[in-house]
Interface confidence: low
């Protein structure tokens, strides 16, 4: 499996779109800052088999897609940018799915490193809870947008390391 240059370009475009989605200054939302405890250890990539790393990356993309495709999200962001964002994420998920199947075979895929995948799920549940508690305010969404940009950067770095291994 080769995470190609095209995939790398998709990553950069995803981050660029996230940056463009910003609607208010993060500095006006400092009081709303929150530590969502990004499971960084799951993205260090050293202790992982390639297939495990790919399944964690896929979960990250899937949960990001879920988060930004809710009704509340549609109301918070520019529709055109969101559409482009979905397309980029969808393309990345397709690439990663193809890789997982190539690396471990269809049968093994669902059972991959459940603990790492759960850590990612729980991270997104913390984000969802925060948005609920903040009643999906513009500042809450801005904090989440910045957080997702940060976590997507970690994903991008892990993918770079995987490409270097190829």
């Amino acid at each position: 499996c080769n995470l190609s240059q095209t995939h790398s370009l998709n990553n950069r475009r995803t981050l660029m779109l996230m940056a463009q989605m910003r609607r208010i200054s993060p500095f006006s939302c400092l009081k709303d800052r929150h530590d969502f405890e990004f499971p960084q250890e799951e993205f260090d990539g050293n202790q992982f088999q390639k297939a495990q790393a790919i399944s964690v990356l896929h979960e990250m993309m899937q949960q990001t897609f879920n988060l930004f495709s809710t009704k509340n999200s549609s109301a918070a962001w520019d529709e055109t940018l969101l559409e482009k964002f979905y397309i980029e994420l969808f393309q990345q998920m397709n690439d990663l799915e193809a890789c997982v199947i190539q690396e471990v075979g269809v049968e093994e895929t669902p059972l991959m490193n459940e603990d790492s995948i759960l850590a990612v799920k729980k991270y997104f549940q913390r984000i969802t809870l925060y948005l609920m508690e903040k009643k999906y305010s513009p500042c809450a969404w801005e904090v989440v947008r910045a957080e997702i940009m940060r976590s997507l950067s970690f994903s991008t770095n892990l993918q770079k390391r995987l490409r270097r291994k190829d």
């Epitope: 603990d115 850590a119 799920k121």
Partner: antibody, heavy 122, light 107 residues
Framework: EVQLVQAGAEVKAPGESLRISCKVS????????ISWVRQIPGKGLEWMVK????????IYNPSFQGHVSISVDKSITTVYLQWSSLQASDTAIYYC???????????????WGQGTLVAVSS | DIQMTQSPSSLSASVGDSVTITCRAS??????FHWYRQKPGKAPELLIY???NLQTGVPSRFTGSGSGTECTLTITSLQPDDFATYYC?????????FGQGTKLDVR
């Protein structure tokens, strides 16, 4: 095999403190939330509080906030429910439960402890 | 809080019968509906999660359906083990809430 094993029944007087335990085994402790659920004898089920054992992040049902507290000891994979001052109305069976989290972040209670009966009477 | 109302509160049936229990939420909970069975003197056990998914090990005579504000649990071909109390639950909003229970007993 996933197991949640709870401590035995407790009989206490009003005003006393109490801590009940739930020892879990058979899975990675820090991967799943744990909740406590109350059942007053002959009545229905009430969700009280949940905790993420990874970082002790808690969410309380406002009806129970301030009256009970939840905690974990990761070293012995045990979750606790504690009262500093019991009331007769705390008489109930208390269940610890494990949350399963689906792909779309729906959580449900897939494993239950056997329950701990707490009787508060003068 | 989201109120969960089960109907009926009690129900009599015979072995081999089919029964349906309904649960209504005071606001939409999407598919965050779950069903549990509690046998006398025992802890509840999960039957159905996310409105219609059968928990591993639960017989296929249990089926769940619905979403939004209403869901149903149907049990076909009742077995002696099925005479118990059934609870619905929502985990869409905090605090999580249960229905008041439906007691199924032998006619």
């Amino acid at each position: 095999e996933v197991q949640l094993v709870q401590a035995g029944a407790e009989v206490k007087a009003p005003g006393e403190s109490l801590r009940i335990s739930c020892k879990v085994s058979g899975y990675t402790f820090t991967s799943y939330w744990i909740s406590w659920v109350r059942q007053i004898p002959g009545k229905g089920l009430e969700w009280m509080v949940k905790i993420d054992p990874r970082d002790s992040y808690t969410i309380y049902n406002p009806s129970f906030q301030g009256h009970v507290s939840i905690s974990v000891d990761k070293s012995i994979t045990t979750v606790y429910l504690q009262w500093s001052s019991l009331q007769a109305s705390d008489t109930a069976i208390y269940y610890c439960v494990r949350h399963y989290l689906t792909q779309s972040l729906v959580d449900y209670f897939d494993h239950w402890g056997q329950g701990t009966l707490v009787a508060v009477s003068s | 809080d989201i109120q969960m109302t089960q109907s009926p509160s009690s129900l009599s049936a015979s072995v081999g019968d089919s029964v349906t229990i309904t649960c209504r939420a005071s606001q939409s909970v999407s598919n965050y509906f779950h069903w549990y069975r509690q046998k006398p003197g025992k802890a509840p056990e999960l039957l159905i999660y996310s409105a219609s998914n059968l928990q591993t090990g639960v017989p296929s005579r249990f089926t769940g359906s619905g979403s939004g504000t209403e869901c149903t649990l149907t049990i076909t071909s009742l077995q002696p083990d099925d005479f118990a109390t059934y609870y619905c639950q929502q985990t869409h909003g905090y605090p999580f809430t249960f229905g008041q229970g439906t007691k199924l007993d032998v006619r």
